[in-house]
């Protein structure tokens, strides 16, 4: 019987470092090895018939035990599939190796209205583009961490908001007078130093009533 396996199905490595993606196989007399890269809608062949393809040959080397990168970039994050078949036969096996290239978060950008109307919906956003794996976001009001559930802390029990740590979106619905304050957010991805945005003041103002 044939086996194709990797003892490291997930590899996390800081950007600009070398890395090896392992692929061990047995039961093939004349193995033909291919490596495929998948990331979202992108699929690329890294290795075909035991040879590194032209787009990778300057920085990837084929070994009998895997492929080795001289230096990885954030664009290399994705799933690599090692596919082994018998030359001229029908034996086949494959193994997937997930590569996560670690990049610390950059300073997040916030979109916070300087004023918003009490009783209305107010949307605050926080995002950063560099972090790999993607960052999770924490919001602060006047320097105090905002819990995911406002009812869980006395300081925020009068607020009505939904906070999504994955997207960084903070939605007040409805906005109340007590939501006035200075807001900032922090991005962290478990690698490098967490980064904090600028603080922006939001005023919760009464609805203008026409005379």
């Amino acid at each position: 019987s044939v086996t194709v396996h990797s003892s490291e199905p997930e590899v996390r490595i800081p950007e600009n470092n070398p890395v090896k993606l392992s692929c061990a196989y047995s039961g093939f007399s004349s193995p033909r090895v291919e490596w495929k890269f998948d990331q979202g809608d992108t699929t690329r062949l890294v290795c075909y018939n035991n040879k590194i393809t032209a787009s990778y040959e300057d920085r990837v080397t084929f070994l009998p035990t895997g492929i080795t990168f001289k230096s990885v970039t954030r664009e290399d994050t994705g799933t690599y599939t090692c596919m082994v078949s018998e030359e001229g036969g029908n034996s086949y096996g494959e193994v997937k190796v997930k590569l996560i290239v670690l990049v610390p978060p950059s300073k997040p950008t916030v979109n916070i209205p300087s004023s918003a109307t009490i009783g209305n919906r107010a949307v605050l956003t926080c995002s950063e583009q560099d972090g790999s794996p993607p960052s999770e976001y924490t919001w602060f009001k006047d320097g105090i961490v905002m819990p995911t559930n406002p009812k869980s802390t006395r300081a925020f029990s009068n607020s009505s908001y939904v906070l999504n740590p994955t997207t960084g979106e903070l939605v007040f619905d409805p906005l109340s007078a007590s939501d006035t304050g200075e807001y900032s957010c922090e991005a962290r991805n478990g690698y490098g130093t967490p980064m904090t945005s600028n603080a922006v003041r939001m005023e919760a103002v009464e609805r203008n009533v026409g005379v």
């Epitope: 396996h5 003892s7 470092n17 070398p18 890395v19 090896k20 392992s22 035990t65 080795t68």
Partner: antibody, heavy 116, light 106 residues
Framework: EVQLVQSGAEVKKPGATVKISCKVS????????MHWVQQAPGKGLEWMGY????????RYAEKFQGRVTITADTSTDTAYMELSSLRSEDTAVYYC?????????WGQGTLVTVSS | DIQMTQSPSSLSASVGDRVTITCQAS??????IAWYQQKPGKAPKLLIH???TLETGVPSRFSGSGSGTDYTFTISSLQPEDIATYYC????????FGQGTKVEIK
């Protein structure tokens, strides 16, 4: 014939650093990752980390992270394991082992004694 | 991380006895288990990989079986030269050894 030959026994004081070598022959050094395994007296085997000699990439077990450094010299087909800030608990036999998927060939072991 | 629980930690058996050692993984390891023999003052020696594949030159009295999380190593007829400590190694996801089983002759 595949062979992994390690350097001789070492006696070190607490706080010191030890560097052990593992010279290979009988195969292409850069084709296989080289691992290091610790065995304290009367105890079991514990994986420490490895190096890919082709590109110098390393991975370390959490327990040893920050104290262990594994390197390789492809000009001499030799792998090295350096352990710093030694303490009495580091008294052990250290093995290098070649990885195919599992560990198929091992060095003879190097005894490191940490004693004041 | 995957943990490997090996039992018994030691056993005493007579020459010719059937000896069984077990290793239980904390999760499915997909048959990626190897067994090693270590004699005093020597490096571990690979006997079996991928649950049951015997290394070249290893006597057929050694065998391995199992699947999922439960694996067994057997010496069908214990010989004096089999006195050693035996270790399992999972290599499905990184590398973890069992605690070892010391085999002695009664």
């Amino acid at each position: 014939e595949v062979q992994l030959v390690q350097s001789g026994a070492e006696v070190k004081k607490p706080g010191a650093t030890v560097k052990i070598s593992c010279k290979v022959s009988g195969y292409s050094f850069t084709d296989y990752s080289m691992h290091w395994v610790q065995q304290a007296p009367g105890k079991g085997l514990e994986w420490m980390g490895y190096i890919d000699p082709y590109n110098g990439g390393t991975r370390y077990a959490e327990k040893f992270q920050g104290r262990v450094t594994i390197t390789a010299d492809t000009s001499t087909d030799t792998a090295y394991m350096e352990l710093s800030s030694l303490r009495s608990e580091d008294t052990a036999v250290y093995y290098c082992a070649r990885q195919t998927d599992y560990f198929d060939y091992w060095g003879q072991g190097t005894l490191v004694t940490v004693s004041s | 991380d995957i943990q490997m629980t090996q039992s018994p930690s030691s056993l005493s058996a007579s020459v010719g006895d059937r000896v069984t050692i077990t290793c239980q993984a904390s999760q499915d390891i997909n048959n990626y288990i190897a067994w090693y023999q270590q004699k005093p003052g020597k490096a571990p020696k690979l006997l079996i990989h991928y649950t049951s594949t015997l290394e070249t030159g290893v006597p057929s009295r050694f065998s391995g079986s199992g699947s999922g999380t439960d694996y067994t190593f057997t010496i069908s007829s214990l010989q004096p030269e089999d006195i050693a400590t035996y270790y399992c190694l999972q290599y499905d996801n990184l590398w973890t050894f069992g605690q070892g089983t010391k085999v002695e002759i009664k």
